[in-house]
């Protein structure tokens, strides 16, 4: 028969014959021959291959370096890489999460729209009319101004985006 020019899925062409790729978690030792199938061996401890492959070496699992603020979120297997995330209060600087930076705080006049995670920074938003934030915080949302009316008080000093209203007693008009 004619030697193949293309192979099926999960196969590769070598020396005019189709050999099976190694399954995830295994590396290639020897191509198939006329006598035997492809020879593959399992990846070792702290190694992985995540696809059907013809790699002769497995990849090393990512190291989550605590000196860079990293910790293991998900331990790697022979078929998956380790996933790193950042320590509490820090977030990754990139999608690959190779280092961490401190979460940003929202300045006075701004509140937290979305609290930071291990992979995303704090998202701040300006406090709209009727709301304020008087602290620099990575957690505090904008607080609504105090409602003087519900306390049977009146506004003595208007609120801003950084300060609450100041309430005071109503002036009692005598007849």
């Amino acid at each position: 028969p004619e030697p193949p020019t293309a192979c099926r899925e999960k196969q590769y062409l070598i020396n005019s014959q189709c050999c099976s790729l190694c399954q995830p978690g295994q590396k290639l030792v020897s191509d198939c021959t006329e006598f035997t199938e492809t020879e593959c061996l399992p990846c070792g401890e702290s190694e992985f291959l995540d696809t059907w492959n013809r790699e002769t070496h497995c990849h090393q699992h990512k190291y989550c370096d605590p000196n860079l603020g990293l910790r293991v979120q998900q331990k790697g297997t022979s078929e998956t890489d380790t996933i790193c995330t950042c320590e509490e209060g820090w977030h990754c600087t990139s999608e690959a999460c190779e280092s961490c930076v401190l979460h940003r705080s929202c300045s006075p006049g701004f509140g937290v729209k979305q609290i930071a995670t291990g992979v995303s920074d704090t998202i701040c938003e300006p406090c709209p009319v009727g709301f304020f934030s008087n602290v620099s915080s990575a957690f505090e949302k904008c607080h609504p101004w105090t409602s003087c009316e519900t306390k049977d008080l009146v506004v003595q000093q208007a609120g801003t985006n950084k300060t609450d209203v100041v309430c005071g007693p109503q002036d009692r008009l005598r007849a």
Partner: antibody, heavy 116, light 110 residues
Framework: QLQLQESGPGLVKPSETLSLTCTVS??????????WGWIRQPPGKGLEWIGN???????YYSPSLKSRVTISVDTSKNQFSLKLSSVTAADTAVYYC????????WGQGTLVTVSS | QSALTQPPSASGSPGQSVTISCTGT?????????VSWYQQHPGKAPKLMIY???KRPSGVPDRFSGSKSGNTASLTVSGLQAEDEADYYC??????????FGGGTKLTVL
């Protein structure tokens, strides 16, 4: 058809270093198989795995022989070699080279005697 | 790592079946499906008969079969023939690019 051939001195003195070479013909040492191994068999005894080498030089040795074994590769000559240091009479054996970790191709073996 | 355990000898008459065992641990035989069996005639190099527990290289008679249960692998030779008389060795992958052989079994055809 792939063929492997061991070569080297048949007699080595105690405390010296045993050196053998395996020449691969009928195929390249850096394609079709990427790992190559050494196995030995003392007279009248069983097989013992010595170690393997990746064609780019990474080595894997038997824990029991690790401190005395060096396996190297020369892709330009299509050869890989075994060195075993500080030999004693217990290292007298037929030494085989073979393909991969599965060992589907073997050399015919060479007897190395350790004696003064 | 210790050698895998094989019976020193086994025998059978022509036409019969013989099974040779190869016992290891969960770190080798039990941990991986990478058991091979080799046949060695006196003065010759070993020949691969079974790989990955039960696969036969083409050219090896189907009288030879392999299996595994737990930490023990087995080679069965059915329909024994005179030329099957030889030494048989098992080997197993033992993790971290390490291999271990069995001590060998001398098969006699009576």
């Amino acid at each position: 058809q792939l063929q492997l051939q061991e070569s080297g001195p048949g007699l080595v003195k105690p405390s010296e270093t045993l050196s053998l070479t395996c020449t691969v013909s009928g195929g390249s040492i850096s394609s079709s198989s990427y790992y190559w191994g050494w196995i030995r068999q003392p007279p009248g005894k069983g097989l013992e795995w010595i170690g393997n080498i990746y064609y780019r030089g990474d080595t894997y040795y038997s824990p029991s022989l690790k401190s005395r074994v060096t396996i190297s590769v020369d892709t330009s000559k299509n050869q890989f070699s075994l060195k075993l240091s500080s030999v004693t009479a217990a290292d007298t054996a037929v030494y085989y080279c073979a393909k991969g970790f599965r060992f589907d191709y073997w050399g015919q073996g060479t007897l190395v005697t350790v004696s003064s | 790592q210790s050698a895998l355990t094989q019976p020193p000898s086994a025998s059978g008459s022509p036409g019969q079946s013989v099974t040779i065992s190869c016992t290891g641990t969960s770190s080798d035989v039990g941990g991986y499906n990478y058991v091979s069996w080799y046949q060695q005639h006196p003065g010759k190099a070993p020949k691969l008969m079974i790989y990955e527990v039960s696969k036969r290289p083409s050219g090896v008679p189907d009288r030879f079969s392999g299996s595994k249960s737990g930490n023990t692998a087995s080679l069965t030779v059915s329909g024994l023939q005179a030329e099957d008389e030889a030494d048989y060795y098992c080997s197993s992958y033992a993790g971290s690019n390490n291999l271990v052989f069995g001590g060998g079994t001398k098969l006699t055809v009576l």
